[in-house]
C-alpha cells in the first residue's frame, strides 16, 4: 500500500528535483514518461530529452512536473488523460507523490484523485476494467547546463542538488531512489 | 458542436453592477481553463479574466482587479463574470473564451455579449 | 508587461499579392506562446495560428507564420477576397499568467 511521504525533503518549499520517470508495470512496456513538444504524453523505451523532467514541490507531498525540454507542465483531465501544458492550471497539474516500500512512486492527481499512468496501446474506453495506480520508478536525471525553464512558481532554493538541502537526513537513513542524487 | 453563448450584456450607468453569463456545451466543461475577453469599441482586444479547470484560481489584468470577479459552475457549465463599479472605458462587446489545453490559446469563442457604461 | 505592436494597422492588398503583416513585442517572447487570429466584421476571433507557425484547423495553406524573440509575422501567399479582415497577434506570458493582444492588422482587398 501507498504510504504518504513524510520526508523532511517535502516540507521545504520549492525543493527541485530532475527525474526520469521509469514504470515497468505489467500492463505496461517498460517505459519513460515523455512530455512531447505537441503536448502529448507517452511513453518512450529509452531515456530521451522529452522524457528528463524537473519535479517540484508545491507543497508537503504534492508536486508539479515539467518536462525540461517542451516546458510544458504534466498535467490530467478528469477523465485521467494526460497532456502537457504551458500553462501550469494547480487544479490540472498537481500530483500528490505516494512512496511505495519497495522505493517505486505512485503519482495521483491532486484534484481528481486519480492516479498518474502513462497512456496504453489501446483506448483507455477499451479497457475491459479500471487499473490500479501505475508505479513509477524515478531515476536521477544529470543536472543539466540549461537555465531553468520559465515561469516556475517560486525561485529555485539553495542547494537544489542536494538531495538533503537542510542536512535533516544522516547517512545512515535509507532513502527513496526519488531522492537519490 | 462545441459552443459559448454569452447572455447578459445591458446598458448600465457608471458606478453599477452587472453580472454576465456564458453557457457552455459540446464539450467537457470541467476540462478546461476559461476566459473573457473584450472588444472595445475601437475593436481592441484585452483579456479581462480567466479561471482554472476547477475555479480555485483566477487571474486579472490590473486595469479590472478588484472590480471584477470571474466564476464557473462545473455542475451547470456555465461561466460567469460579475463585474461592479463598472467605468465608461468598460463598455465593450464582451466574449466568453476557452482555453485550449496545451498552448492555452483561446481556442473557441461565444458570439459576444455588449455592455454599455453611459449616464 | 510586455506590449505587442502590430504594423501596419491598414493595409489595402490586390487579389493574388504577398502580404505580410509584423508584431513586434517589447521585450522577448516564446514562439510557443504568440498567436494569431482573424476576425471578420459581425463575427468573432478565430484562431488562426498557433504557436507562431502552426494553422488551426480550416486555415488555407497559403497563410504561414513565422518569428522568434521580439519579431512575429503572418503572411499570406497570395492575397484572396475570403482573407480580407482583422489578424491580431496574441501573446500569453507564464508568471504571472497574463494574455496581450495587439492592436490588429487590417487587411483589405485593393
Known amino acids: 500500500h501507498p504510504i504518504p511521504d513524510s520526508s523532511p525533503l517535502l516540507q521545504f518549499g520549492g525543493q527541485v528535483r530532475q527525474r526520469y520517470l521509469y514504470t515497468d508495470d505489467a500492463q505496461q512496456t517498460e517505459a519513460h514518461l515523455e512530455i512531447r513538444e505537441d503536448g502529448t504524453v507517452g511513453g518512450a523505451a529509452d531515456q530521451s530529452p522529452e522524457s528528463l523532467l524537473q519535479l517540484k514541490a508545491l507543497k508537503p507531498g504534492v508536486i508539479q512536473i515539467l518536462g525540461v525540454k517542451t516546458s510544458r507542465f504534466l498535467c490530467q483531465r478528469p477523465d485521467g488523460a494526460l497532456y502537457g501544458s504551458l500553462h501550469f492550471d494547480p487544479e490540472a497539474c498537481s500530483f500528490r507523490e505516494l512512496l511505495l516500500e519497495d522505493g517505486y512512486n505512485v503519482y495521483q492527481s491532486e484534484a481528481h484523485g486519480l492516479p498518474l499512468h502513462l497512456p496504453g496501446n489501446k483506448s483507455p474506453h477499451r479497457d475491459p476494467a479500471p487499473r490500479g495506480p501505475a508505479r513509477f520508478l524515478p531515476l536521477p536525471g544529470l543536472p543539466p547546463a540549461l537555465p531553468e525553464p520559465p515561469g516556475i512558481l517560486a525561485p529555485q532554493p539553495p542547494d537544489v542538488g542536494s538531495s538533503d538541502p537542510l542536512s535533516m537526513v544522516g547517512p545512515s537513513q535509507g532513502r527513496s531512489p526519488s531522492y537519490a542524487s | 458542436e462545441v459552443k459559448l453563448v454569452e447572455s447578459g450584456g445591458d446598458l448600465v450607468k457608471p458606478g453599477g453592477s452587472l453580472k454576465l453569463s456564458c453557457a457552455a456545451s459540446?464539450?467537457?466543461?470541467?476540462?478546461?481553463?476559461m476566459s473573457w475577453v473584450r472588444q472595445t469599441p475601437d475593436k481592441r482586444l484585452e483579456w479581462v479574466a480567466t479561471i482554472s479547470t476547477g475555479g480555485g484560481y483566477t487571474y486579472y489584468p490590473d486595469s479590472v482587479k478588484g472590480r471584477f470577479t470571474i466564476s464557473r459552475d462545473n455542475a451547470k457549465n456555465t461561466l460567469y463574470l460579475q463585474m461592479s463599479s463598472l467605468r465608461s472605458e468598460d463598455t465593450a462587446m464582451y466574449y466568453c473564451?476557452?482555453?485550449?489545453?496545451?498552448?492555452?490559446?483561446?481556442?473557441?469563442w461565444g458570439t459576444g455579449t455588449t455592455v454599455t457604461v453611459s449616464s | 508587461q510586455i506590449v505587442l505592436t502590430q504594423s501596419p494597422a491598414i493595409m489595402s492588398a490586390p487579389l493574388g499579392e504577398r502580404v505580410t503583416m509584423t508584431c513586434t513585442a517589447s521585450?522577448?517572447?516564446?514562439?510557443?506562446?504568440l498567436h494569431w487570429y482573424q476576425q471578420k466584421p459581425g463575427s468573432s476571433p478565430k484562431v488562426w495560428i498557433y504557436?507562431?507557425?502552426n494553422l488551426a484547423s480550416g486555415v488555407p495553406t497559403r497563410f504561414s507564420g513565422s518569428g522568434s524573440g521580439t519579431s512575429y509575422s503572418l503572411t499570406i501567399s497570395s492575397m484572396e477576397a475570403e482573407d480580407a479582415a482583422t489578424y491580431y497577434c496574441?501573446?500569453?506570458?507564464?508568471?504571472?499568467?497574463?494574455?496581450?493582444f495587439g492592436g490588429g492588422t487590417k487587411v483589405e482587398i485593393k
Open positions: 459540446g464539450f467537457t466543461f470541467s476540462s478546461y481553463g
Open positions: 473564451a476557452r482555453h485550449d489545453l496545451v498552448d492555452w490559446y483561446f481556442d473557441v
Open positions: 521585450s522577448s517572447v516564446s514562439s510557443s506562446y
Open positions: 496574441h501573446q500569453y506570458h507564464r508568471s504571472p499568467p497574463t494574455w496581450t
Open positions: 504557436r507562431t507557425t
